[in-house]
């Protein structure tokens, strides 16, 4: 028998420095977790102790903190090279800065193979990107070879900016011929490494003949066997075992997100490359693991540029940006409008001639807006200003909801109106009218939404049975501020871009902003 140790990360999202337990900015260092310096310590410890070790990443290194905003992927290549990753799969967020923003900082600089079998380049891009990412790679490990085949969410064109010259094929259809090719090369140990979410990971394990292990990402799935070491609740055991259609037991793993854990899977293969056994658990990268001093010194060196960036002007406002709780928790506020407009703008994707855009709606809990910005400081808006408005380091995500769920969400928005609570919703692409004289749960008297399947966008009444795409904070998608109906009833959830980054990009693009209060939210009683 031959034993392989797979170390894996996914959805690191720019968390190069250690973070707090909830993956936001580290405040109390003695309680902080993750970060590449700590990850390196643990990886090196395992490499020294065990003979056959692979370090893999299942995508979405890009996007999530000021590190990505400033360094645009160069930081990913540099520190993944320093940690000596063996392979990476492309995630949807690797396309956030377009194909050029993937090629230049990452594909050209990575000292490890970057993989995806279901992304096919066409047109002028085909030759430009040829060889820079691969469908699979055969890696020597000890005296054996292991095939790694990559895959990426086929929803990427709706979630990021891959352009028109990349075709995202069905994962299973694309993977099978590449796995077959590896078999003809006498590679009998094959890992599928990819970024399509846990449900697709399980399908790949079930349907793709010849795949021995699936290492996934995208859904931030936490798997654990035994008592979990932190706040994350396991979605199943680690590894999650899927019985394939041809009767094999295929381990499927994922390691939550944000570099908080290092996935650790030990696989035993027989001489024919069949999996005999698999066991392991994610390792919590808490403060009991020291940060590697040389990587930490490198992080501190790269950090300097970030501190300079946060005080530079992004753009100007010529109006007061009212982000006060007195406004945003009670009525339409122009800071809410600005943020929602930025959220929609960040999700403009012309993927279908029938639609002017795939999504037109935004909702945002008023309690998530934490500060106003005064225009009397020469109108200057900096990253620092925006960090005061959006201090939680969240993301603006894409969900699919039924109209009935949205209606419930708007009822929840005003179910205890007047107590300055955070659930009051700010909106974009939505016109809502409340009647507060009615009883809670029946206060929404009008709810019109902006059409997407139209050449001239206009507002139509919400249909209860229709499925709508909505951009909202991850906090709401996860049921925060009491929006349990969103969490329970959402039909799809894809994590998006860092909140501050979305707004800062929009302000930089617009240069001068002047958001107004324009009647998106109205009250039909005389007292408002």
């Amino acid at each position: 028998a031959w034993e392989l140790t797979i170390l894996h990360t996914n959805d690191v999202h720019s968390r190069l420095e250690q973070t707090s337990e909830d993956s936001s900015k580290c405040v109390n260092a003695s309680r902080c977790m993750g970060g590449v310096a700590r990850l390196f310590t643990k990886v090196q410890q395992i490499r020294r102790a065990e003979p056959n070790v692979l370090l893999l990443d299942a995508g979405d290194q890009y996007q999530g903190t000021i590190w990505f905003t400033v360094y645009k992927g160069a930081e990913v290549a540099h520190f993944m090279n320093a940690l000596r990753y063996d392979a990476m799969a492309l995630g949807n967020h690797e396309f956030d800065n377009g194909v050029e923003g993937l090629i230049e900082p990452l594909l050209k600089e990575a000292k490890f193979p970057i993989l995806s079998a279901n992304i096919k380049a066409k047109g002028p891009l085909a030759s430009q990107i040829s060889g820079l990412y691969l469908p699979y790679k055969v890696l020597p490990v000890g005296d054996e070879v292991v095939g790694i085949v990559g895959y990426t969410s086929k929803e990427t064109p709706f979630l990021s900016n891959p352009g028109t010259n990349l075709v995202f094929e069905d994962e299973i259809t694309a993977l099978q011929p590449e796995v077959d090719k590896l078999k003809t090369l006498n590679v009998n140990k094959i890992i599928a490494l990819g970024h399509s979410g846990f449900e697709m990971d399980k399908l790949i394990a079930q349907k793709v003949r010849g795949v021995d292990v699936v290492v996934g990402g995208h859904s931030n799935t936490f798997l654990y066997t035994g008592n979990p070491p932190s706040k994350e609740v396991p979605a199943g055991k680690y590894p999650f075992i899927v019985t394939s259609d041809d009767g094999r037991k295929v381990p499927v793993v994922q390691a939550y997100a944000f570099g908080k854990y290092l996935g650790y899977l030990k696989i035993e293969f027989d001489e024919r490359g069949n999996v005999i056994s698999s066991h392991g658990n994610p390792i919590l990268l808490n403060s009991s693991i020291p940060e590697d001093p040389s990587i930490k010194a490198d992080i501190n060196k790269w950090r300097i540029k970030l501190d300079n960036y946060s005080t530079q002007e992004l753009g100007k406002t010529i109006v007061y940006l009212d982000g006060s709780s007195q406004s945003c928790r009670f009525r339409e506020c122009n800071m809410g409008n600005l943020i929602c407009d930025a959220m929609i703008n960040n999700n403009l994707r012309h993927t279908d001639e029938m639609f002017w855009n795939h999504v037109s709606m935004c909702i945002l809990n008023g309690g998530g807006i934490r500060s106003p910005i005064d225009e009397r400081n020469n109108g200057t808006i900096t990253w620092e200003n925006l960090a005061a408005v959006l201090p939680f380091g969240g993301t603006f995500d894409l969900v699919q909801l039924k109209g009935s769920t949205l209606k419930k969400a708007f009822e929840h928005s005003v179910h205890r109106y007047g107590q300055s609570t955070g659930e009051f919703l700010q909106v974009g692409g939505i016109h809502v009218v409340y009647d507060l004289s009615r009883k809670p749960g029946d206060r929404v008297v009008k709810l019109d939404v902006l059409c997407t399947k139209c050449r001239v966008p206009s507002y139509d009444p919400l249909k209860m049975d229709e499925v709508y795409k909505v951009i909202l904070p991850n906090f709401l998608a996860n049921g925060g501020d009491g929006f349990q109906m969103i969490k329970d009833e959402l039909l799809r959830h894809d994590s998006g871009d860092q909140d501050i980054n979305v707004v800062s990009t929009y302000i930089s693009k617009m240069k001068v902003i002047y958001p107004a209060v324009e009647g998106r939210i109205k009250f039909s009683t005389g007292s408002h």
């Epitope: 000596r84 230049e104 000292k111 430009q128 060889g131 020597p140």
Partner: antibody
Framework: QVQLVQSGAEVKKPGASVKVSCKAS????????MHWVRQAPGQRLEWIGN????????KYNEKFKSRVTITVDKSASTAYLELSSLRSEDTAVYYC??????????WGQGTTVTVSS | DIQMTQSPSSLSASVGDRVTITCRAS??????LTWFQQKPGKAPKSLIY???ILLDGVPSRFSGSGSGTDFTLTISSLQPEDFATYYC?????????FGGGTKLEIK
């Protein structure tokens, strides 16, 4: 297949400059960095610098920084190495090499530069 | 700069022999080491990058191992076309630096 074809041998006087070319074919020129390396008689190989053909970004060995310029002509899929203020110790074979995964991987056939008065 | 020390500087062997060449770095270079072959008057030919990954078309009798500061190139069964000079280079950090070479001659 990947091919790097370098210009012919050069004989130069001390103090002069030399410009060596490296024409790439068999791949998209702008997609890979290009290294330049030299090998002087009886000496170990020396890395001179490299260039990103898509944007002209360069990295140079400090030893050569004041005298070397690496450029590209994207339309001709050609990289150039220019070395000025030549001295006898610059007599060497100069190689271009395509960079893959950070490392020089595919090499040109070399250009002999002789510096002699 | 990182110094690369190769040994031996020359080596005599016969067809079919197993040969090992070593390369030592003056500091940790992770696994970022390439081996290449050069024959007189010819362009260098890279064989292995990142310590142990063979470039396309390189025969499987060539293999590499090591990490940190100590690395080896092994040719499992020498063929007539393998007699040449072998070099290592590190690309962990700039400037890229080279070993002094090992000349492999027919015994």
């Amino acid at each position: 297949q990947v091919q790097l074809v370098q210009s012919g041998a050069e004989v130069k006087k001390p103090g002069a400059s030399v410009k060596v070319s490296c024409k790439a074919s068999g791949y998209t020129f702008t997609s890979y960095w290009m290294h330049w390396v030299r090998q002087a008689p009886g000496q170990r190989l020396e890395w001179i610098g490299n260039i990103n053909p898509s944007n002209g970004g360069t990295k140079y060995n400090e030893k050569f920084k004041s005298r070397v310029t690496i450029t590209v002509d994207k339309s001709a899929s050609t990289a150039y190495l220019e070395l000025s203020s030549l001295r006898s110790e610059d007599t060497a074979v100069y190689y271009c090499a395509r960079r893959d995964y950070g490392s020089p991987s595919y090499w040109g056939q070399g250009t002999t530069v002789t510096v002699s008065s | 700069d990182i110094q690369m020390t190769q040994s031996p500087s020359s080596l005599s062997a016969s067809v079919g022999d197993r040969v090992t060449i070593t390369c030592r770095a003056s500091q940790d270079i992770n696994s970022y080491l390439t081996w290449f072959q050069q024959k007189p008057g010819k362009a260098p030919k890279s064989l292995i990058y990142r310590t142990n990954i063979l470039l396309d078309g390189v025969p499987s009798r060539f293999s590499g191992s090591g990490s940190g500061t100590d690395f080896t190139l092994t040719i499992s069964s020498l063929q007539p076309e393998d007699f040449a000079t072998y070099y290592c280079l590190q690309y962990h950090e700039f400037p890229v630096t080279f070993g002094g070479g090992t000349k492999l001659e027919i015994k």
